[in-house]
């Protein structure tokens, strides 16, 4: 969490941002809140990016003001216009690109004063893994697949029964470049699997950590997956 305060002259207002991560090719949100004002026409929101000459987005006098917008953000940004009055300056970002990563500034002017806060935005690719029993294999084998990751993640297997065991000798992981030549498909195979056990396939890079669990018994197979972003720090 980054909390910024205004500059001298006028009164300062508190602006708060949260560091976040964007998934390449998907839509993202850059979070920013501020002390609200009673008049929408008195609120100015400016989003800036370090190293970019034009603005990322500007909202003032109750509408988007895009004459100074940098071309790399054209047609890709919007604020939640109906929530500005309650202090939400968060920015929607369409079709997140690798090059969108960097330091952003959320700069606010209201009738109460000015304030700003920086936000670190990471970009990459992350997806939920799915673990299945590989019935084509000669021995009991599990196959963990996740369609989109970047940068290249690490893959670690674990099991409930053999806690702390190192499965690197009995697993094989491969990374296959996807058609857009940035993200990769992750495939990891675990051999010599025993029944009545829960196995976890953990995929992690510096942006996200995802886990796919599978419990195999004689009567059923249960699966569960979850994904966690690693860098959500508020400012």
């Amino acid at each position: 969490l980054i909390i910024g305060f205004g500059i001298s002259g006028r009164h300062s207002i508190t602006v708060t941002t949260v560091a976040s991560a964007g998934n390449i090719g998907e839509d993202g949100i850059l979070s920013c809140t501020f002390e609200p004002d009673i008049k929408l026409s008195d609120i100015v929101i400016q989003w800036l990016k370090e190293g970019v000459l034009g603005l990322v987005h500007e909202f003032k006098e109750g509408k988007d003001e895009l004459s100074e917008q940098d071309e790399m953000f054209r047609g890709r940004t919007a604020v939640f216009a109906d929530q500005v009055i309650v202090g939400n300056a968060s920015l929607r970002l369409k079709n997140v690109q690798l090059t969108d990563a960097g330091t952003y500034k959320c700069y606010i002017i209201t009738s109460k004063g000015k304030g700003n806060a920086n936000l670190e935005y990471k970009t990459g690719a992350f997806s939920m893994p799915e673990v299945n029993v590989d019935y084509n294999a000669s021995s009991e084998t599990l196959r963990c697949e996740a369609p989109r990751w970047f940068p290249q993640p690490t893959v670690v297997w674990a099991s409930q029964v053999d806690q702390g065991a190192n499965f690197s000798e009995v697993s094989n992981t491969s990374f296959e470049l996807n058609s857009e030549n940035v993200t990769m498909k992750v495939v990891s195979v675990l051999y010599n699997v025993t029944i009545n056990n829960t196995y976890s396939c953990m995929i992690e890079n510096d942006i996200a950590k995802a886990t796919g669990d599978i419990k195999v018994t004689e009567s059923e197979i249960k699966r569960r997956s979850h994904l966690q972003l690693l860098n959500s720090k508020a400012s």
């Epitope: 090719g25 509408k63 988007d64 003001e65 895009l66 054209r74």
Partner: antibody, heavy 121, light 107 residues
Framework: QVQLQESGPGLVKPSQTLSLTCTVS??????????WSWIRQHPGKGLEWIGN???????YYNPSLKSRVTISVDTSKNQFSLKLSSVTAADTAVYYC?????????????WGQGTLVTVSS | DIQMTQSPSTLSASVGDRVTITCRAS??????LAWYQQKPGKAPKLLIY???SLESGVPSRFSGSGSGTEFTLTISSLQPDDFATYYC?????????FGGGTKVEIK
């Protein structure tokens, strides 16, 4: 509700400049929040996006036409215009003006009724 | 540029039929896809935006689905008024591009 109407000559000579205007009624271009686009459709063919403009004057053009296209806006008349230079018979098409749904979602609605421009000597 | 490929190019169907039109993008466009209906001599009419959101005033027999590169427009029960040409359009990235169209004609 917002309505759009294209106007301009239906016949243009080769090598000349095609000029069309889109008049917006039922809403103000200056209210912001929307990009205003030009789209064309060759006879019996599909649709081609030409470019767009924001009320403040910032534009984006389809790279395939960029060297020949100029889109401008006149907020006092609530109009935006298209100029396409050095036209050939390949520019014969129905030209539509349209509004995007928002600054981030550019599905087009509403559209003008379209105007046929024929390039011929 | 992102290429949009529609199939089939022509579709013959009868009133009451369930009709499905497919649109494929040359690269992922997330959910940034719109569908239009066009009748001869008229401007296209927006039916669906953001892949599955029904435009106000459009009958509920029209629905859209898909994300990434594969999308479908479904007409659950074809009505006489639905015989027209349908186009998909991506607004994920500039320049915006349209599919080649699917003409739905009477069988």
């Amino acid at each position: 509700q917002v309505q759009l109407q294209e106007s301009g000559p239906g016949l243009v000579k080769p090598s000349q400049t095609l000029s069309l205007t889109c008049t917006v009624s039922g809403g103000s271009i200056s209210s912001g929040g929307y990009y205003w686009s030009w789209i064309r459709q060759h006879p019996g063919k599909g649709l081609e996006w030409i470019g767009n403009i924001y009320y403040s004057g910032s534009t984006y053009y389809n790279p395939s036409l960029k060297s020949r296209v100029t889109i401008s806006v006149d907020t006092s008349k609530n109009q935006f215009s298209l100029k396409l230079s050095s036209v050939t018979a390949a520019d014969t098409a129905v030209y539509y003006c349209a509004r995007g749904l928002s600054t981030i979602d550019e599905a087009f609605d509403p559209w003008g009724q379209g105007t046929l421009v024929t390039v011929s000597s | 540029d992102i290429q949009m490929t529609q199939s089939p190019s022509t579709l013959s169907a009868s009133v009451g039929d369930r009709v499905t039109i497919t649109c494929r993008a040359s690269q992922s466009i997330s959910s940034w896809l719109a569908w239009y209906q066009q009748k001869p001599g008229k401007a296209p009419k927006l039916l669906i935006y953001k892949a599955s959101s029904l435009e106000s005033g459009v009958p509920s027999r029209f629905s859209g689905s898909g994300s990434g590169t594969e999308f479908t427009l479904t007409i659950s029960s074809l009505q006489p008024d639905d015989f027209a040409t349908y186009y998909c359009q991506q607004d994920n990235s500039y320049p915006y591009t349209f599919g080649g169209g699917t003409k739905v004609e009477i069988k």
